[in-house]
Amino acid sequence: IWELKKDVYVVELDWYPDAPGEMVVLTCDTPEEDGITWTLDQSSEVLGSGKTLTIQVKEFGDAGQYTCHKGGEVLSHSLLLLHKKEDGIWSTDILKDQKEPKNKTFLRCEAKNYSGRFTCWWLTTISTDLTFSVKSSRGSSDPQGVTCGAATLSAERVRGDNKEYEYSVECQEDSACPAAEESLPIEVMVDAVHKLKYENYTSSFFIRDIIKPDPPKNLQLKPLKNSRQVEVSWEYPDTWSTPHSYFSLTFCVQVQGKSKREKKDRVFTDKTSATVICRKNASISVRAQDRYYSSSWSEWASVPCS
Amino acid sequence: RNLPVATPDPGMFPCLHHSQNLLRAVSNMLQKARQTLEFYPCTSEEIDHEDITKDKTSTVEACLPLELTKNESCLNSRETSFITNGSCLASRKTSFMMALCLSSIYEDLKMYQVEFKTMNAKLLMDPKRQIFLDQNMLAVIDELMQALNFNSETVPQKSSLEEPDFYKTKIKLCILLHAFRIRAVTIDRVMSYLNAS
């Protein structure tokens, strides 16, 4: 058993049929010695008396808010949560496996630049009685500070018969140099509590590996005289690290119709303009990627050909 | 510390091309190592990230773009002394800091070159003959060093009398390649920045 926060405790349980469970001793936070009784949740049934209460925690029915009273007055609370371990593996029931970039990916993180700011998100099908708290650091043995905000519900989607909820959090490394060469990874830890179930999820990464620039901005087309070719130009996204001559991007320019199966023109360039063949009913799209360290491409920025 | 000798401005900053080749060569070599040593811990997640130049050179700090010198987090610089007289320097336009930067890059390359050559000598003794360093990568390191053209004492190649542990050598190769790739990215960024200046 360990303390998650004040008056909230996590009991770690090996979860299998007829498991013996864990013996837990609760102590009432009071100078009083006599006349103390214990109840669980909203029930008025007295579970025991005395300053301490010893319980055998085996299942979710044994978890919940234990309250010690004296003469109708509440003295203190202890909330017990369960953390299940099945076949030596901690449960991951609360969050959905996003399977990208590999199986057992529950947390996904992205950074728009090298400033040390990043966003992580996760998915769940649970809509109520759900809380998250997020901690982060650079390195684990001698951790350096990363400050994370509160996790918020950022999107809701319908997936077949199910609703899916996306939560996200923004974090900022306290003293980040965009030009630094990372040797210690960022660690992100998410505590998830659903009703009386506790789970924790972690992710470890270098900012350089989670870079995904914003799409290029200000796409403009200039038809070339006596030709089917069009000069397309764009600018670096505002959120990208500066100076751009140091933090350079490379671009992919594509002309394609509405369907992905349609024919296309595609060209890669380090410049902020390119010449392509425009077709009727097609769109010109441009995306960006760090020129020197190949992490993710940005989403496409698009303009119609006509 | 002597300032760089003035040479005619070569127009296109001559080291940019070499640094692009360097990044390409080390990325290819790292990819080859990951594939060949698939049963060894050779991915970014599996290895310890060590920097053999730590406390010996200060490339990131010495080559910091002017725009980032206002960022206090970027200025925990280590003082290191370098000999400078580089031919990549676009002469009159070159500041003292730029000379220091290129000199630091040169020292990085020299240190990695020695490590890689020592390692290759060990890998050539491996009866499995599983992996060797790409001669192209070693040649590209050499080309960039020649283009930088700094005077510097030669570092003797480390020779080891004891029987090499090939498993450890291959893991060390992965660690070195990962670190060198990160440094090659920095070098490429620096050359691009200097070329644009």
């Epitope: 349609e262 024919k263 296309k264 023109d265 060209v267 890669f268 360039t269 380090d270 010449t275 077709r279 | -």
Partner: antibody
């Protein structure tokens, strides 16, 4: 299976015009760009131009501009290359090539040898 | 027009050898570079697109690298069916242009 089958060999006199065909099968003809590339004996490859069969848009290499015409007939799924004012240096194998992407060549015809000789 | 220069023009090698062919563009073409294999009397066949992207059905011993002006095609362990002529082609701008070819011959 995506396939391009070209017409047979041709022998032409200098100054004449040649028209060779390229019949597509195994895909929707207008879904791919069609290119023509030639190869002179013992020499390398030379791109001549492309057509978008969907709308008839064409683009030619400056070297051949004015002498070459590329057309496409969507009713027969066939592309054509017409080269006029032939000279001996036009003796070559002419290939049609197709792709959904405009700028490289995924599927090739077997080639048509055109000999220009007096 | 962008000129593409291949080297060497021919190379003699044995089965099992590692062969590298290079291609240089007269100006920067990013990764807009493709490789083809051609056997005598046959049409070319696409091996690699956009400098390093593999083509389905092409053996994994063929790999490409490069960007900007310098590119290379590597055949990792040469097989008897790999003796052929190899061409690079730039797609950065029209007109599309090819390298002069590299003939890989049996030693």
């Amino acid at each position: 299976e995506v396939q391009l089958v070209q017409s047979g060999a041709e022998v032409k006199k200098p100054g004449a015009t040649v028209k060779i065909s390229c019949k597509a099968s195994g895909y929707t003809f207008s879904d791919y760009y069609l290119h023509w590339v030639r190869q002179r004996p013992g020499k390398g490859l030379e791109w001549m131009g492309w057509i978008d069969p969907e709308n008839g848009d064409t683009e030619y290499a400056p070297k051949f501009q004015g002498r070459v015409t590329i057309t496409a007939d969507t009713s027969t799924d066939t592309g054509y290359l017409e080269l006029s004012s032939l000279r001996s240096e036009d003796t070559a194998v002419y290939y049609c090539a197709a792709n959904k992407e405009l700028r490289y060549f995924d599927v090739w015809g077997q080639g048509t040898l055109v000999t220009v000789s007096s | 027009d962008i000129q593409m220069t291949q080297s060497p023009s021919s190379v003699s090698a044995s089965v099992g050898d590692r062969v590298t062919i290079t291609c240089r563009a007269s100006q920067s073409i990013s990764i807009n570079l493709h490789w083809y294999q051609q056997k005598p009397g046959k049409a070319p066949k696409l091996l690699i697109k956009f400098a390093s992207q593999s083509i389905s059905g092409v053996p994994s011993r063929f790999s490409g690298s490069g960007s900007g002006t310098d590119f290379s095609l590597t055949i990792n362990s040469l097989q008897p069916e790999d003796f052929a002529t190899y061409y690079c082609q730039q797609s950065n701008s029209f007109p599309l242009t090819f390298g002069g070819g590299t003939k890989v011959e049996i030693k």
